[in-house]
Structures are given as structure tokens and as C-alpha cells.
Interface confidence: medium
Amino acid sequence: LEPTCLHFSELLPARLRELRVKFEEIKDYFQSRDDELNIQLLSSELLDEFKGTFGCQSVSEMLRFYTDEVLPRAMQTSTSHQQSMGDLGNMLLGLKATMRRCHRFFTCEKRSKAIKQIKETFEKMDENGIYKAMGEFDIFINYIEEYLLMRRRK
């Protein structure tokens, strides 16, 4: 097991704090444009999946969703926030890489039903989906935190 994996739980609060601080830089831009509050993209169903048996797969898939689909599109909506979004993407990639390296902590398999729904809604909402997904990024961080804290306790 890699040394970073042994210290992963200690590094966790700092990693999540970094994500939150970085999101603060762009939060207003996206949340002020996310006006479809009748729709919640990241529902409690996703959190249930994160905390379930196949949580790792769901977390990995959501990290990929944000790094590969949401952030690249979000970057096209505002030139003045590209640096912050790039940093956010790199932080998520770092988290994903750590999870992959420390695979003994995270058993990954099985496709996710909740994420299929999230992606369908995201696509259907078109540009509004970008503001929605980015506007709810704070919810995403909280869900990751709950998942990782749960893994740490096991």
C-alpha cells in the first residue's frame, strides 16, 4: 500500500477545504444563473448511492462527469472564471487518482442508476444544465465528504 494511502484520511479535510475555497471563487457566477430551482440535479438518491455498497463506482463516475463533461462546458460560459474552473478540475483529478491508487480502500464496480438520471437531466437542460451542475457543486463536495468519512470509519 502506498504511503499516501496510509495518510489519506489525514489529508482528507484539507483536500475538501481546498475544493470549497476554490468553488467560492466561482459560486456566485453559477448560482446566480441557476434559476431552475424546481429541479435538483444532485438529489439525496445520489448520496444514498455514494453511501451504499457500490459507492466507489458512483463517486468515480460523478468525478468523471464533472471533469469530462461539466467543467469543460462550464469553461466556455465565462472566460474570467476559467482559471478557477481549471484548478477545480485538477483537484478532482487528483482525488480520482488517489482513489485509484488506494484501491484497497475503495471497491469499484457496477453502473449507477442515479447518475444515468443526472446525466439525462443535465443534457435535457442544455446550457441551464451547466449552471445547475456547477451551482450544485457545493452539494457534490458534501456528498464526497460523506462518502470519504464513511470509508474512513470502516
Partner: nanobody, 115 residues
């Protein structure tokens, strides 16, 4: 338990003005977006206006130039000044606030514009 307490509203003539207030029971909202939705009879709840902690505002096209949203972070309160009211502005108005995470809603307040 987080609560949003709304006040204002009532009956007003076409072309008149009203001011709605929404006070949050905790200052968490001074760091987050707050705003207003409305729901007319037999219609879906629709967006009216929002304001971020750094005063970025966003308005529905139907209220632009007539409604003004503002906030007082010290009081954790958001306001909606409604001028040049029309009959189609008649609805129950709900304030909302983004928490961490999720959305909190006020109890709603009736605004009736009579011609």
C-alpha cells in the same frame, strides 16, 4: 432548524407598489444566494429574481425594470421591491435561500393586483 420568515404582500391596485421581506433565522445565508419565486393559481412555480452575497442580481424577463431585489447581509434579509404592478403579477411569492447544501423556502405570501 433553519427558517425563512416572509412579510409584506397584500392587495394593491394596478400600477401600485409593494415590498416583500424575507428574514433568515441564521446568518449562513449571508454567504449564499437568496431570491424569490412565485406561483400563480394553476401554474408552476416560476423564478422571479435572485441576488448573490456579492450583489450579482438576476431577474425573470417579465419583471425586469419593475422589480428590484436587494439584501441586508447583517440582518440576513432579502427584499423584493415591486413597482408598476400588473394583474399578471398576482401570485403567492416564496423567498428561497441556498444553504449548504440544498435550498430552503419561505412560507409564501399572497400578492393580489386588482385592476
Amino acid at each position: 432548524q433553519v427558517q425563512l420568515q416572509q412579510s409584506g404582500g397584500g392587495l394593491v391596485q394596478t400600477g401600485g407598489s409593494l415590498r416583500l421581506s424575507c428574514a433568515a433565522s441564521t446568518n449562513i445565508f449571508s454567504r449564499n444566494t437568496m431570491g424569490w419565486y412565485r406561483q400563480a393559481p394553476a401554474k408552476q412555480r416560476e423564478f422571479v429574481a435572485s441576488i448573490t452575497r456579492s450583489d450579482i442580481t438576476n431577474y425573470a424577463d417579465s419583471v425586469k425594470g419593475r422589480f428590484t431585489i436587494s439584501r441586508d447581509n447583517a440582518k440576513s434579509t432579502v427584499y423584493l421591491q415591486m413597482d408598476s404592478l400588473k394583474a399578471e403579477d398576482t401570485a403567492v411569492y416564496y423567498c428561497y435561500a441556498r444553504g449548504r447544501p440544498g435550498i430552503y423556502w419561505g412560507q409564501g405570501t399572497q400578492v393580489t393586483v386588482s385592476s
